[in-house]
Structure formats: C-alpha cells, structure tokens
C-alpha cells in the first residue's frame, strides 16, 4: 500500500526517500525487508540510512530489493516500502524504458526539462545535459538550476534527455544520471470548447466486484498545440490525488491526433479490486481548456456474472 519504486545504475549514487515520511525530524528506521536486517546509520557504510533518506553511495546490483522504513513515535509508527532496483550500466547509448522517468512535453513558448529526483541530492550547478547520449552544446541550450531550457524549440528537439550531476557526501563525489523523454508539441492550430468523446454523459459502466476496471476519459480541444488543456477524473468532486484511495489511480494516456487533425488527450482511471463502496461514488470525466470546462458523469453498476449451465 505505501510502496514506491526507485531505480538507479550501478556505481552511481542513489538516494531514496521513505514513502511514509510526513513531517521532518521524526526518527526513521530502515530495514532490508528480505532479512529484516537493520540498515546502519553510520556514514562509513556504503549503504546507510540518514533519517527519511536511504543512501546507496555508490549503488550495486546486489542492493536491489525491498527496503522497509518505519517512521517512529511512541504512539504511532508508520511503515513504508521502497522497492529498489539497481541496473548494470549499458555499454551502448540506448537508455532502456525501465530507466526512464516520466515524459515531458514542450513547445516554443515552454521548453523546461526538469532533472528527475535531483532534489534528493547534495549537488552544485551546473548540471550536464545530454540528448541521445550527445553532450548538448550551443547557445540554444541553457542549464538553469535543476532544469534545462531550450530556446526556439523545434520538432527535432524531441528525444531522450539525460541530466548528469555530482552528489557530494562528506567530501566524496558520486555521479548520478537520470533520463526522461521530451516531446515537442506543434504550435500551429486553434482551440475549441472541449469535446468529450468518452465516456458518454451519465454513462453506466458495468463492473465486477473484486476485478479491476478501467475508465477512459477522452476529449479533444482543437488543432495543434493546446495551452492549458487537460483531462482528469474526479471522485465525488474531489481530485484523485486528494481523494486518497490507493486502489484508484489515474494514468495519463498518449496524446492523440485523429485523422481530422484534432488534438486530444486521454486519462485512464484504473480501479483495482473493485469494491461495493466504489459503486456509490460519482466518477466525473473533466475536460478543460481556456474556453471552459466540460464534465461527463459516470456511475458504476454491478455486472452480474453470467450463469453457465451444462
């Protein structure tokens, strides 16, 4: 339930934050889950715990596994799990999908690429940036704080961008790299009041109790690059992230461009292990842009399993 995936490369630094950390200053104990062995806090160890952070300096493939963190107080302990995977360095240039952080999109007016996870590290500017393994050079590229700015973005700027920086721990330096894809949105076009293609207004979606269910919110906003265009799901009028039910998550789909050239967005709502109480909720697919907001409401109903007679 309170688990987070983290990954890194061997011989690089990796720092992981306890998924259950709330306020700073609380005592946090770390354990290697498979053996229940306590992670030391002494910094002379290659892997050590430092409050809410677990540090691999540097990481080794054998460090892969699940780590338990317990945020302690006399009246309320809170437990989280960090699922850590350390990969061998690739000899070629390709960065495999499992090492990629979330994709970001840019346009001529907005082309910031943030370096993932950098806030966990003790680093100093400037960052080094690479595109498809080539060091970025030229006046169009500006490394600013923890992000890269590209001037006059063109479609050719799409690709995989890697940030590289040095983490300093007690005078010792460790390399860290992180990669994410960057896509470029077309500037030409127009925007319309959002049109929701799915779901239909007041649609009833049949689901089976105990099974998983997916709801797709799909809307089109015009042609070309869309500013402030978004699709999202709400539960009982509350954002999914604020509703706080881990079984119900939304996952951004691909930008779609239909044959008529319209720019559309998908948002998939995934409900794991559907429960009776999920049938009581109101699911709203919201599509919004500068023109306004359109809402389609979906409710779930129980799908009765078909009787099979011999």
């Amino acid at each position: 339930k309170f688990s987070k995936q983290s990954w890194g490369l061997e011989n690089e630094a990796l720092i992981v934050r306890c998924p259950r950390q709330g306020k700073p200053s609380y005592t946090v104990d770390w354990y290697y889950s498979q053996t229940n062995k306590s992670i030391p806090t002494q910094e002379r160890n290659r892997v050590f715990a430092s409050g809410q952070l677990l540090k691999f300096l540097p990481a080794a493939v054998a460090d892969s596994g699940i780590y338990t963190c317990i945020v302690r107080s006399p009246t309320f302990n809170r437990t989280g799990y960090a699922n850590v995977t350390i990969y061998k360095k690739q000899s070629d240039c390709n960065v495999p999908d499992y090492l990629m952080y979330s994709t970001v999109s840019g346009s001529e007016k907005n082309s910031k690429i943030y370096c993932p996870t950098i806030d966990l590290y003790n680093w100093t500017a400037p960052l080094e940036w690479f595109k498809n393994c080539q060091a970025l050079q030229g006046s169009r590229y500006r490394a600013h704080k923890s992000f890269l700015v590209i001037d006059n973005v063109m479609t050719e700027d799409a690709g995989d961008y890697t940030c590289k920086f040095i983490h300093n721990e007690n005078g010792a330096n460790y390399s860290v790299t992180a990669t994410r894809s960057f896509t470029v949105k077309d500037e030409q076009g127009f925007s319309l009041f959002p049109v929701i293609g799915a779901p239909a207004q007041n649609e009833i979606k049949e689901v089976e109790i105990g099974k998983n269910a997916n709801l797709t919110c799909s809307a089109c906003f015009g042609k070309g690059t869309q500013f402030l265009a978004a699709v999202l799901w709400q539960l009982n009028g509350t954002k999914i992230t604020d509703f706080g039910e881990p079984r119900i998550q939304q996952e951004e789909g691909q930008n779609q461009s239909f044959s008529n050239g319209l720019a559309c967005l998908d948002m998939v709502l995934r409900i794991a292990d559907v429960k009776e109480e999920d049938l009581l909720l109101q699911y709203d697919c919201l599509a919004l842009n500068l023109h306004g907001l359109r809402r389609h409401t979906v409710r779930l109903s129980r799908k009765n399993p078909i009787d099979h007679h011999s």
């Epitope: 107080s73 309320f76 706080g244 039910e245």
Partner: antibody, heavy 117, light 111 residues
C-alpha cells in the same frame, strides 16, 4: 485540500447517547492517518477523547473508555463518535481532527453539544 | 496519565515584545532523541491550529516569530515579536503515551 465537518444533534438529554459524525472530504480515511475526537467544555481546555486509525484500530482516553465508541463508515468517508450515559459535564464543543503522527494537523470547525433535560 | 501544567494562566504583552509560555509535564515526554511535546494556538470561535511539533519544529506556514524549546519535562513556547493578531489561547499537548493530553491553556492578550 482536506476538510472535516462535524454534524449531529446540538441537544442531548441526560443518560442518553451522544452521537456525532465527521464527514471528511479531500482524503480517504482508510488510506492513512488517525482520525480523532477532541472536546472542549465552554470556557475550558481541550480533552482528547480518542481516535481510530486508517487500519481500524481504536485508542480511547481511559477516563471515557467505558462510554466511548469511535467507528468508521468507509462508504461515506465518515467517522463517528458515540458517548453513552451523558451528563451535564459532557456539554462541550466537539471537534473532529486528523492526526498525522502525534499532532492534529486538520480540524473541523466544531459543534456545540448541550446535555440538558 | 501525564499531566501538563501551563504557566502563566494568562499574560498581556505589548506589540513588538516577547511572550513566553511554559509547559511542565508530570513526567518526561522525551525518548529516543525526540521530545513529544507540541503547541497549538486557538483563536476565539475557531478550532486549534498546530504551531510547533516535537518541541521545536515549526509547522509549515507558521511564522518564524513562533519558536519552541525544551526537553524532558520543561518546555517553552516563545513569540517574538508579538503582533496584534496573536491574541489567542495557547495549548501544549504531549504524545509520549496514551492518553494524549493537553495543558489547561494560556490566554495571551495584546496590550
């Protein structure tokens, strides 16, 4: 944004059971944290009644334990307080709140319950 | 139960001056390197608001004029400088064990 709102009768007769409900919006109460009831007699200080954790475990103030039940209605994202055999000394503003670790970081506005015949 | 005794019961301070409120616990609320004492502010007609947790940590969004200190059984909330809108009741609360208990409160008035 997490919001809590208390509801229930403002007047309860002596020896009866006080029943209050706290409706939580912006967060699922079964996901995490502990969900408290605290009361404050008019012009007096705060008294912790007890809480129920996201896991369903309950912890009560021993001074009230024999009379208190805190429960959760997950379908409505609500938690409730029942206090039996009330007397005039139970007249207070009753607050519901969220406890993260040790501290109550979100509170309802409170509801005044008067015990009187 | 751990009994928390606040002093003074009330005080009046001029704007720009320092206000100091103390809270004494009937037994130590410190263990494993942390002190499980917290401070709240309650303005008339409002619920309490968390100011300080673990004796000295400022809650997010609370002005740096508020600070906490202490360990073991003796704790202090300091407001420096005091402002006009600091008029309120202030409560300490411990979480060293169950039941959680509050101090009886200190009323701060601004002259």
């Amino acid at each position: 944004q997490v919001q809590l709102q208390e509801s229930g009768p403002g007047l309860v007769k002596p020896s009866q059971t006080l029943s209050l409900t706290c409706t939580v919006s912006g967060y699922s109460i079964t996901s995490d944290y502990a969900w408290d009831w605290i009361r404050q007699p008019p012009g007096k200080g705060l008294e912790w009644i007890g809480y129920i954790r996201y896991s369903g475990d309950t912890y009560y103030n021993p001074s009230l334990k024999s009379r208190v039940t805190i429960s959760v209605d997950t379908s409505k994202n609500q938690f409730s307080l029942k206090l039996s055999s009330v007397t005039a000394a139970d007249t207070a503003v009753y607050y519901c709140a969220r406890t993260m670790m040790d501290t109550m970081d979100y509170w309802g506005q409170g509801t005044l319950v008067t015990v009187s015949s | 139960d751990i009994v928390l005794t606040q002093s003074p019961a009330s005080l009046a301070v001029s704007p720009g001056q320092r206000a100091t409120i103390t809270c004494r616990a009937s037994k130590s609320v410190s263990t494993s390197g942390n002190s499980y004492m917290h401070w709240y502010q309650q303005k008339p007609g409002q619920p309490p608001k968390l100011l300080i947790y673990l004796a000295s940590n400022l809650e997010s969004g609370v002005p740096a004029r508020f600070s906490g200190s202490g360990s073991g059984t003796d704790f202090t909330l300091t407001i420096n400088p005091v402002e006009a809108n600091d008029t309120a009741n202030y409560y300490c609360q411990h979480s060293r064990e169950f039941p959680l208990t509050f101090g009886q409160g200190t009323k701060l008035e601004i002259k």
